[in-house]
């Protein structure tokens, strides 16, 4: 599972994979997270005078057992990779380091007025990975107010030194802040002849593109398909670069596919994981473990939960199948990619989803089998992400529902805060079934930060989404845990098993219910929903649910709560209860905010906030 704790004055002995320089433990942890085999790291923040060359050393480590012996070392900070940590996985690093010179290959020196301009220059340069800025007080006049753009083979500094009046930092391309823009073009039957920086084996050009995007020096790629004439190059993904940052004109070549890194994209950046399962394909590699499961998706889930697993093969051969299921072979390699890909086997292969930012945070993969108008009483722990948002003025009242999406995050509807946008008056209760069980002693969460979508306007229906950052992180229990968020790619997924929950009215002129209600409701296509609501605009950021004959629906008091659908064995938060004309009326579906349409916004808000949260909690 996800382990976020840092161990001060602790060094892990052995298990060494690689050593790099990073400015702090957080960046070291990030590097470990994205390294295909790294599970543990040790960072030397302080070293004795004789070992100054080891200061800022980031030692990436692996372990078959998932742990290593710890030794006491003053100034060392150790911890775990954030593989399997969902929301917290991000390549973005905004921190600025005063008094540090992050060294590398200086390829450009420009005059800028301030550090922000320097960082922007780096973010908008193809080759820049990190930078150093000399302030106006720097001891060498010729370098004052100069911005040095840098790169290295690893993407990290070649060394780091303390230096007065120097400030260093990283490019913000991985924060989706580059203004370069990114060509999404995929060139079929074309190859780029430029310089190769690395090569990996991939099943298709899309995985190749994602690997290129997260490789420190890849700007574009050429992938050779299984039909390519040279056998040794079949399924090989060549990661490439050039001095100009742009590829030379593509050369026509049968069975070659080329394209660009998406690092400089502002919106369409891929996740650092590959979710597709490839049928009839065999990913070869070192075998880690074998288990018997029912279905390739369960095999993928098993791989995801096994932290060292990088990819898997699920075999359907008769000799590989038993009563409890078929053979699921969990595998790994040095670079995280298969050592060879072959075709025609009976079964499927795919990758671990341990680096997926959201879709598969293991915390939320709970397999739960599953007034709402026309609903029934829920049972304790059945919908552990459901919370009650209550306002405490003279008395305390339930106003809205919400969904836990992280230890410190609740997702709800913006309209819940119409007229009451004051964090102090709200109390949030999780892990409860009946509102009557809430007493003065019942623990509640308070709002640290209320983030209402900037485009939301009262009464106008759109952008009905809000994030609540809690003052203190939640403890996950059997009755209180997060719901998985969809990915942006899930906007067209067809869901067939959807449920809405809440303590809202059970009839139009009703009252709040004591026991949490649940109801299964079919989704209604937007075009059909629009016909039912001729007075309103049903846009693609909305999703509708309801029975043609009515009778089952969300209602007043359910607002902000979840519309969840079970997909591939996992519950996902598909909608946020938003609005309706009456409740449970014939031909009047309930309307929900479509969560997949807001994934960029959710990520932007939770990540920009979480960077600060990590910074303060580990200082």
């Amino acid at each position: 599972g996800c382990m976020t704790q840092l161990y001060k004055n602790t060094f892990f002995r052995g298990g060494d994979l690689a050593a790099i320089y990073t400015p702090d433990a957080q960046y070291c942890q990030k590097m470990c997270t994205f390294h295909p085999r790294c599970l543990l790291f040790s960072f030397l923040a302080v070293t004795p005078p004789k070992e100054t060359n080891k200061r800022f050393g980031c030692f990436m480590k692996e372990s078959i057992t998932g742990t290593l012996p710890r030794i006491h070392r003053t100034g060392a900070i150790s911890g775990h990779s954030l593989k399997q940590c969902g929301h917290q996985i991000s390549a973005c690093h905004r921190d600025i380091y005063k008094g540090l010179d992050m060294r590398g290959s200086n390829f450009n020196i420009s005059k800028t007025d301030n550090i922000e301009e320097c960082q922007k220059l780096c973010t908008n340069n193809f080759h820049c990975q990190f930078f150093t800025y000399a302030t106006s007080a720097f001891y060498r006049p010729e370098y004052r107010k100069k911005c040095l753009l840098k790169h290295s083979a690893s993407g990290t500094p070649t060394s780091i030194k303390s230096a007065d009046n120097l400030v260093s930092g990283f490019s913000l391309k991985s924060c989706a802040l580059s203004e370069i823009g990114c060509p999404m073009d995929i060139f079929q039957h074309s190859a780029f002849a430029d310089l190769n920086v690395s090569q990996v084996i991939t099943p298709d050009a899309f995985v190749c593109r994602t690997i290129c995007t997260f490789h420190p020096n890849c700007l574009f790629f050429t992938f050779y398909t299984n039909e390519w004439e040279t056998e040794s190059q079949r399924n090989v993904c060549f990661l490439k670069t050039s001095k100009s940052g742009r590829p030379s004109p593509p050369i026509p070549q049968e069975n070659a596919i080329s394209g660009y890194s998406l690092l400089t994209c502002r919106k369409t950046r891929p996740e650092p994981c590959h979710s597709k399962i490839y049928s009839g394909v065999d990913f070869e590699g070192e075998e880690l473990n074998v288990t018997f499961v029912q279905g390739a998706d369960v095999c993928q889930e098993t791989c995801t939960k096994t932290i060292r697993c990088q990819f898997f093969i699920y075999s359907l051969l008769p000799q590989d199948c038993k009563e409890e299921g078929c053979k699921c072979s969990l595998r790994l390699s040095t670079d995280g990619s298969p050592t060879r890909i072959t075709y025609g086997m009976q079964g499927s292969s795919g990758y671990s989803l341990r680096l997926c930012k959201l879709v598969d945070s293991p915390d939320c993969t709970t397999k739960i089998n599953a007034r709402i108008v026309g609903g029934t009483n829920a049972s304790l722990g059945e919908w552990p992400w459901q919370v009650s948002l209550q306002v405490k003025l003279v008395s305390q009242t339930h106003l809205c529902g919400g969904s836990i999406i992280g230890r410190q995050w609740v997702l709800t509807a913006a309209h819940c805060f119409d007229g009451i946008p004051y964090p102090d008056v709200w109390r949030i209760y999780g892990g409860i079934l009946s509102l009557s069980e809430i007493t003065k002693e019942t623990p509640s969460s308070r709002i640290k930060e209320l983030i209402i979508h900037q485009e939301y306007k009262v009464s106008e229906g759109n952008y009905d989404i809000a994030l609540i950052k809690l003052q203190t992180p939640l403890n996950y229990t059997e009755f209180q845990k997060p719901i998985c968020l969809p990915s942006k790619a899930d906007t067209n997924t067809i869901y067939t098993n959807c449920w809405v929950t809440g303590w809202g009215y059970t009839k139009e002129q009703g009252e709040t219910q004591n026991i949490l209600q649940k109801a299964t409701i079919p989704l209604v296509p937007n075009e059909e929903c629009q016909k039912k609501y001729r007075d309103y605009v049903i846009n693609k950021q909305m999703i509708c649910a309801g029975y043609k004959e009515g009778g089952t629906d969300a209602c007043k008091g359910d607002s902000g709560g979840p519309l969840v659908c079970k997909h591939s064995g996992r519950w996902q938060l598909v909608g946020i209860t938003s609005w309706g004309e009456g409740c449970g009326r014939k031909d009047q579906p309930g309307v929900y905010t479509k969560v997949s349409e807001y994934m960029d916004w959710i990520l932007e808000k939770t990540q920009s906030s979480d960077v600060r949260a990590l910074e303060t909690s580990s200082a």
């Epitope: 009262v458 009464s459 009456g582």
Partner: antibody, heavy 128, light 109 residues
């Protein structure tokens, strides 16, 4: 206490223009749809125009479409009606009214159904 | 467009009597119907919304009923201040806006 106060009415020649204002107080103006409703002397009520809380959406009766423009300034809690190309049949008392939502509608998308508060009206006379 | 008709055009009654006013829509308006009272020289005042819900501050002698196309406003016992013109109104399909009935005048017999 909710209050709506219209101003800007008067005598104008056919083809002329006039701008009506409605100053609102006693409620959160930016949360509500607002409308203009008129009443010709001795006649019934006729809805003229409506504007959404943010001002992003407007609708007009066919009789005034293309000639009248509704707008609002939420920072000043004021509703406006710009009337151009005025005709004799536009002579009426013009009321500013707050849009009330149905108890049945819930959530973030509230269309106005009724007019729960009205101003006292301002008389517009179009005559040569 | 949905047309609204009101009957009778005039209702002559004495204080203390029961008044029954009718409003008919040319097609169903569900329960989305309101009643207003207007006295000479004054702005209209909302009495009933959603066909049967009394607006804030409206006395209990006023009640509304009906749904679909036929609606009724009842004043159980007329008070002197109730003599006025009463309008029904529906919000027809949103792009079309709002439609008022022609009104029923309740005057003293």
């Amino acid at each position: 206490e909710v209050q709506l106060l219209e101003s800007g009415g008067g005598l104008v020649q056919p083809g002329g223009s006039l701008r009506l204002s409605c100053a609102a107080s006693g409620f959160t103006f930016s949360y509500y749809h607002m409308s203009w409703v008129r009443q010709a002397p001795g006649k019934g009520l006729e809805w003229v125009s409506v504007i959404s809380p943010s001002g992003g959406s407007t609708k007009y009766a066919d009789s005034v479409k293309g000639r009248f423009t509704i707008s609002r300034d939420n920072s000043k809690n004021t509703l406006y009606l710009q009337m151009n190309s005025l005709r004799a049949e536009d002579t009426a008392v013009y009321y500013c009214a707050r849009g009330g939502s149905s108890d049945y509608a819930w959530g973030s998308y509230r269309r106005p159904y009724y007019f729960d508060y009205w101003g006292q009206g301002t008389l517009v006379t179009v005559s040569s | 467009d949905i047309q609204m008709t009101q009957s009778p055009a005039t209702l002559s009654l004495s204080p203390g009597e029961r008044a029954t006013l009718s409003c008919r829509a040319s097609q169903s308006v569900s329960s989305y119907l309101a009643w207003y009272q207007q006295k000479p020289g004054q702005a209209p005042r909302l009495l009933i919304y959603d066909a049967s819900n009394r607006a804030t501050g409206i006395p209990a002698r006023f009640s509304g009923s009906g749904s679909g196309t036929d609606f009724t406003l009842t004043i159980s016992s007329l008070e002197p201040e109730d003599f006025a013109v009463y309008y029904c109104q529906q919000r027809s399909n949103w792009p079309r806006g709002f439609t008022f009935g022609p009104g029923t005048k309740v005057d003293i017999k």
